[in-house]
Interface confidence: medium
């Protein structure tokens, strides 16, 4: 069964700057990745970035840099200042659309006791939805 993992990390250099990493553990080819915060996309969450293998990347504040890390994983850096910046308990969700598996989404947030610059290794997060 495909799985999605989500890792949220606070940067040591900027205490309110976050890096979100997400990956898809499946054999299909990824056609779209959507990163949102505040909940799943389409269920109260707000889109931060959309990554498409051919059409490129679109991002909205507070996203600062979204990029592909591998063919099946992405990273997103969030700017660390301003009223729309994330806080420690913000939930981030990643939705991967792949063929032939369909859409898989998981969410994660900063571990409660994480030190700046540290984070738990990326482990599969609970799958919230499979379309």
């Amino acid at each position: 069964t495909p799985e999605v993992w989500v890792q949220v990390r606070m940067e040591a250099t900027e205490l309110s700057s976050f890096t979100i990493r997400c990956g898809f553990l499946g054999s299909g080819s990824i056609s779209l990745v959507t990163v949102s915060w505040g909940g799943p996309n389409g269920a109260g969450g707000t889109t931060l970035a959309v990554l498409h293998p051919e059409r490129g990347i679109r991002q909205w504040a507070p996203a600062r840099q979204a990029r592909w890390e591998t063919q099946s994983s992405i990273s997103l850096i969030l700017e660390g200042s301003g009223a729309s910046s994330p806080c420690a308990n913000t939930t981030f969700c990643c939705k991967f659309a792949s063929f032939p598996e369909g859409s898989w989404e998981a969410c994660g947030s900063l571990p409660p006791s994480s030190d700046p610059g540290l984070s738990a290794p990326p482990t599969p997060a609970p799958i919230l939805r499979a379309d």
Epitope: S31, L32, T34, T46, T47, V50, H52, R55, G56, I57, R58, Q59, W60, A61, P62, R64, E79, G82, A83, S84
Partner: antibody
């Protein structure tokens, strides 16, 4: 010439649904986002949502997430917006608009607009 | 959501004079050297028309008497010299984050 042709005026009853269309010509609909914007009488403009027709990816304002459904048919160069559970507050002119050609430079400005579709919700 | 406050709500300007419309954002709409603020003109019975994108870039086909400036939270649309056909409602719109929002509009009357 770039054009967005919208469907005609609609008179619908409260609680009903309506589906508006926006047909593009003069450009490839797959090269852009198509957005929908609401203008109520004597009020300003409100962004409802948008779609990337090439891949079907949609974006919505949270206010409209439950009532608006945006789709596109690239074969006919047409974008659609369905509005459900309509109330008198949804009486408005609805515009579709083309975003500047898809680009990582993040313009997100709407450079061509349809003529608007008037929707009246009344019993 | 970012709130855009336009002022004045209405403006009367003599033909050939300068019209200045202000748009203030509730937080900065500038990042990485870009200001994600755009200006539109709307006449009665017509759809909005893009005038200025990214704060200061004149849209193709728009007369050079229109100009935009500003960064951060404060932006200005200038029209000089004003012509009779400029009578319309003007809106600012940001696109820095989702959802994009519009200002309340400024109604420009020419005398």
């Amino acid at each position: 010439e770039v054009q967005l042709q919208q469907s005609g005026a609609e008179l619908v009853k409260p609680g009903a649904s309506v589906k508006l269309s926006c047909t593009a010509s003069g450009f490839n609909i797959e090269d852009t986002y198509i957005h929908w914007v609401k203008r109520r009488p004597e009020q300003g403009l409100e962004w409802i949502g948008g779609i990337d027709p090439a891949i079907g990816n949609t974006l919505y304002a949270s206010k409209f997430q439950d009532m608006a459904t945006i789709t596109a048919d690239t074969s006919s160069s047409t974008a659609y917006m369905q509005l459900s559970s309509l109330t008198s507050g949804d009486t408005a002119v609805y515009y579709c608009a083309r975003e500047r050609v898809y680009s990582n430079t993040l313009y997100y400005a709407m450079d061509y607009w349809g003529q608007g579709t008037s929707v009246t919700v009344s019993s | 959501d970012i709130v855009l406050t336009q002022s004045p709500a209405s403006l009367v300007v003599s033909l050939g004079q300068r019209a200045t419309i202000s748009c203030r954002a509730s937080k900065s709409v500038s990042i990485s050297g870009y200001s994600y603020m755009h200006w539109y003109q709307q006449k009665p019975g017509q759809p909005p028309k893009l005038l200025i994108y990214l704060a200061s870039n004149l849209e193709s086909g728009v007369p050079a008497r229109f100009s935009g400036s500003g960064s951060g939270t404060d932006f200005t649309l200038n029209i000089h010299p004003v012509e009779a056909e400029d009578a319309a409602t003007y809106y600012c719109q940001h696109s820095r984050e989702l959802p994009p929002t519009f200002g309340g509009g400024t109604n420009l009357e020419i005398k």
